[in-house]
Interface confidence: low
Amino acid sequence: STGASSHCQKTSLRVNFEDIGWDSWIIAPKEYDAYECKGGCFFPLADDVTPTKHAIVQTLVHLKFPTKVGKACCVPTKLSPISILYKDDMGVPTLKYHYEGMSVAECGCR
Amino acid sequence: STGASSHCQKTSLRVNFEDIGWDSWIIAPKEYDAYECKGGCFFPLADDVTPTKHAIVQTLVHLKFPTKVGKACCVPTKLSPISILYKDDMGVPTLKYHYEGMSVAECGCR
């Protein structure tokens, strides 16, 4: 998601499963840090936002034609798992050590 | 990059290498379609935008707290190569069949 003036970076985003209705099947944890990718993808794109060639091209086109094309977007480029205790189909509490793709590990410009 | 009211999709983006200053080393083509990912990542995220679990979580948090967190972003999820004729370090025209990551193959919500 895009942010204001700061450059693309990972920021904390505490998520309470009750808020999103997932408490009906996730027993624990009650909340976790999903993190969020915030900030702009400004020219020149720095190495730390690991830009693709397409993101570089789009950034350059945006520089030339800002109304024609948007900047690249700051998004998760690598996700990490969390451990959850959830209710399986039979309602039995089951532990999943690696519930993949739930938390941002790295952000970048795409 | 985000768009107005349409949902996340791939749209044409013609890029002229002269416009971005790459004509100094790319001999051909003069222009190509980089494509662009445009549109919003709205709830519920459809299968065709191949949302990650994190994107789904972020979308749900955005629904509950729209001012606290942004929507997921519509970005390239798969890129494809183009063929280019370029000048190598010695200025010799060289053909590269697969110059990777230059064109959008698929868009998704991340």
């Epitope: 027993i27 624990a28 976790y32 840090d33 451990s83 205790l85 509490p93 089951t94 532990l95 | -």
Partner: antibody
Framework: QVQLLESGGGLVQPGGSLRLSCAAS????????MSWVRQAPGKGLEWVSI???????HYADSVKGRFTISRDNSKNTLYLQMNSLRAEDTAVYYC?????????????WGQGTLVTVSS | DIQMTQSPSSLSASVGDRVTITCRAS??????LNWYQQKPGKAPKLLIY???NLQSGVPSRFSGSGSGTDFTLTISSLQPEDFATYYC?????????FGQGTKVEIK
């Protein structure tokens, strides 16, 4: 009220075995994670092992392959089977209840049982 | 494994003093940090769970704060019964790990 009572400690020779027990009362035993934590003389606390309310178990690297944690929910009892004991295993062993079904704060502790490994 | 580092390892204070103990995790443990008090010959006692929640029956002079990697235990006005060793422990993931302890002694 919640009570945890350890037993089974004593003097054992290096290489020997010992089984510790922890009798629990005052709560629904099967719904909580249970841990063993030890403290060598004059040293700090060292977490040893946990059995989650789900039945899953975890061990500290220092005891992996030698110690086995288990629970009998019908008897409200936690066990720690200790094999191939070493001098460095000498410590007071505490049984502790996790405040939840998975890893969490240890909200109730037993009084501890002393294990001495010496020849 | 997540390493927990406490500071200081010991401190001398007087009754009525405000005492602060810090704990640093080697990686992000969110808010899953707990504080224990232990007196000689006794079992540890839970004071604070999940960084800032006061365990039932614990005096309100004890408080905890922090999230991520840096945490603090504060005793607002030290009482005679507070002279003990204090440990932090993370419960974010297994293996659960403790800090090395902070001994609070009478000045």
């Amino acid at each position: 009220q919640v009570q945890l009572l350890e037993s089974g400690g004593g003097l054992v020779q290096p290489g020997g075995s010992l089984r510790l027990s922890c009798a629990a009362s005052g709560f629904t035993f099967s719904s909580y994670a249970m841990s063993w934590v030890r403290q060598a003389p004059g040293k700090g606390l060292e977490w040893v092992s946990i059995t989650l309310g789900t039945g899953h178990t975890h061990y500290a690297d220092s005891v992996k392959g030698r110690f086995t944690i288990s629970r009998d929910n019908s008897k409200n009892t936690l066990y720690l089977q200790m094999n191939s004991l070493r001098a460095e295993d000498t410590a007071v062993y505490y049984c502790a209840r996790g405040s939840y079904i998975i890893w969490s704060a240890l909200d109730y502790w037993g009084q501890g049982t002393l294990v001495t490994v010496s020849s | 494994d997540i390493q927990m580092t406490q500071s200081p390892s010991s401190l001398s204070a007087s009754v009525g003093d405000r005492v602060t103990i810090t704990c640093r995790a080697s990686q992000d443990i969110r808010s899953y940090l707990n504080w224990y008090q232990q007196k000689p010959g006794k079992a540890p006692k839970l004071l604070i769970y999940d960084a800032s929640n006061l365990q039932s029956g614990v005096p309100s002079r004890f408080s905890g704060s922090g999230s991520g990697t840096d945490f603090t235990l504060t005793i607002s006005s030290l009482q005679p019964e507070d002279f003990a060793t204090y440990y932090c422990q993370q419960s974010d993931t297994s293996p659960l790990t403790f800090g090395q302890g902070t001994k609070v002694e009478i000045k």
